[in-house]
């Protein structure tokens, strides 16, 4: 697995322990957490740096409506089981033996159940809408500018294929960005969109998960975009099974209708 | 340490040109701009404009459009600020200062070149 | 234009003492940037995004306010504080200065 040969760090994820023991005293590194060994060239699974994170120290409307069964992660930060590739198992249970089923990006999408919960297959997420809100800028964002400016983001930075960003919507002060891969879509050493989208949540929460670099700077025509808020939208290819108990408001989070719980991460 | 170091005073007769440089170290140059702002005698801060040396982008204050040119060298981590028809009321310290953002916040102006005094005088 | 008014122009107070400084917008701003100059040197950031302090200030220094007025207090000044203190917006182009109070010793 490549790293940056002469210190031995990973530039695409700060959670590792690297050491050059690899194949010809390569440099190798392993997540925090799991020790699962890591591409260094290209994003860290959204599962390996959940674990990894645990085990450290603690007018015309444009814009999209996201869809009956988009779900959001209410639940927050838990210990994932992940398989041996990292992704995450189709089913988590925690220490008390609470057990749920989840998507291909973690976030629960069945009732909490105990043992005997059967979780036959790990549900794709293939869209995501990631809702933000920016704060009052000197200069008005170009929403073709800006539409160029994200999609070069995640090309450059969280290393996306584009064809995976479908859509940069923007109702000032909201952007939308859709990030959409199907199954059959994704090709071997594609970077997931589950995983572009964590990276980039924890980028606009001022966590960067990329080794030595400061904080994002994200320019539009060099005038800095600063997020207020984030709301992310998950949707399955197969919709979500929940109990009319929290379809009609059981669920937590105050959300307005169905799953739409409004996660602030600011 | 970031440090921004600017060249040295200027005296500039009336209609004339000045070209103040500002010498950026200690940070990646290409992901921060670069303001101007002067001071004139017994006044306060005026804000002049500023570039972003990553892609080139500029804003300048109404009040200088068309007088105010702000280029960058990126190969030198060098700003230049070029005032051009000089006046006497242009007599000042001008000062490039660096502004840091990122996604969570704007940090402000912050270091500060040293200043450089421009006379304009006949 | 957002027209910045700083008062008073000056606060003539001892050392040790509390200094209580304004900057009033013309219009509601979301954020206001402090800044300290002594004579002969270049401006100093001190408070970023209304009440952050910037690194290396003393704590001594702390930022308020909202909408239109915004206060700079120093809870106990030092001989080092004697200075110009200028608020900045960044809500609109241009970028406006207040035009400063300055700290003396009584």
């Known amino acids: 697995h490549t790293a940056a040969q002469d210190n031995c760090t990973c530039p695409t994820n700060k959670m590792t322990v690297c050491s050059p023991d690899g194949p010809g005293g390569r440099c190798q590194c392993r997540a925090l957490g799991s020790g699962v060994a890591v591409d260094c060239s290209t994003l860290t699974s959204k599962c390996l740096l959940l674990k990894a994170r645990m085990s450290a120290p603690k007018n015309a409307r444009t814009l999209v409506r996201p869809n009956e069964h988009a779900l959001v992660d209410n639940d927050g930060l838990y210990d994932p089981d992940c398989d041996p590739e990292g992704r995450f198992k189709a089913r988590q249970c925690n220490q008390t033996s609470v057990c749920w089923c989840v998507n291909s990006v973690g976030v629960r999408r069945t009732d909490k159940g105990d043992l005997s919960l059967r979780c036959d297959e790990l549900v794709r997420t293939h869209h995501i809408l990631i809702d933000l809100r920016h704060r009052p800028t000197a200069g008005a964002f170009n929403h073709s500018d800006l539409d160029a400016e994200l999609r070069r983001l995640f090309r450059e930075r969280y290393r996306l294929h584009p064809k995976f960003v479908a859509a940069v919507h923007y109702e000032q002060p909201t952007i939308q960005i859709e990030l959409r891969q199907n199954t059959s879509q994704k090709a071997a050493g594609d970077v997931d969109i589950g995983d572009a989208a964590y990276y980039f949540e924890r980028d606009v929460k001022g966590e960067s998960l990329f080794q030595g670099r400061g904080g994002l700077d994200l320019r539009v025509r060099g005038e800095p975009l600063q997020v207020e808020r984030t709301l992310i939208y998950y949707l399955d290819e197969i919709p979500p099974k929940f109990s009319m108990k929290r379809l009609t408001g059981g669920g937590s989070g105050g959300g307005s209708h169905h799953h739409h719980h409004h996660h602030h991460h600011h | 340490q970031v440090q921004l170091v600017q060249s040295g005073a200027e005296v500039k007769k009336p209609g004339a040109s000045v070209k103040v440089s500002c010498k950026a170290s200690g940070y990646t140059f290409t992901s921060s701009d670069i303001n101007w702002v002067r001071q004139r005698p017994g006044q306060g801060l005026e804000w002049m404009g500023w570039?972003?040396?990553?892609?080139?982008?500029?804003k300048y204050n109404e009040k200088f459009k068309g007088r105010v040119t702000m280029t960058v060298d990126t190969s030198t981590s060098t700003v230049y600020m070029e005032l051009s028809s000089l006046r006497s009321e242009d007599t000042a310290v001008y000062y490039c200062a660096r502004r840091f953002a990122t996604v969570v916040s704007n940090y402000g102006l912050d270091p500060w070149g040293q200043g450089t005094l421009v006379t304009v005088s006949s | 234009e957002i027209v910045l008014t700083q008062s008073p122009a000056t606060l003539s107070l001892s050392p040790g003492e509390r200094a209580t400084l304004s900057c009033s917008a013309s219009?509601?701003?979301?954020?206001i940037y402090w800044y300290q100059r002594k004579p002969g040197q270049a401006p100093r950031l001190l408070i970023y995004d209304t009440s952050n302090l910037a690194s290396g200030i003393p704590a001594r220094f702390s930022g308020s306010g909202s909408g239109t007025d915004f206060t700079l207090t120093i809870s106990s000044l030092e001989p080092e504080d004697f200075a110009v203190y200028y608020c900045q917006q960044w809500n609109s182009y241009p970028l406006t200065f207040g035009q400063g109070t300055k700290v003396e010793i009584k």
């Open positions: 219009s509601s701003v979301n954020y």
């Open positions: 570039i972003y040396p990553r892609d080139g982008s500029k």
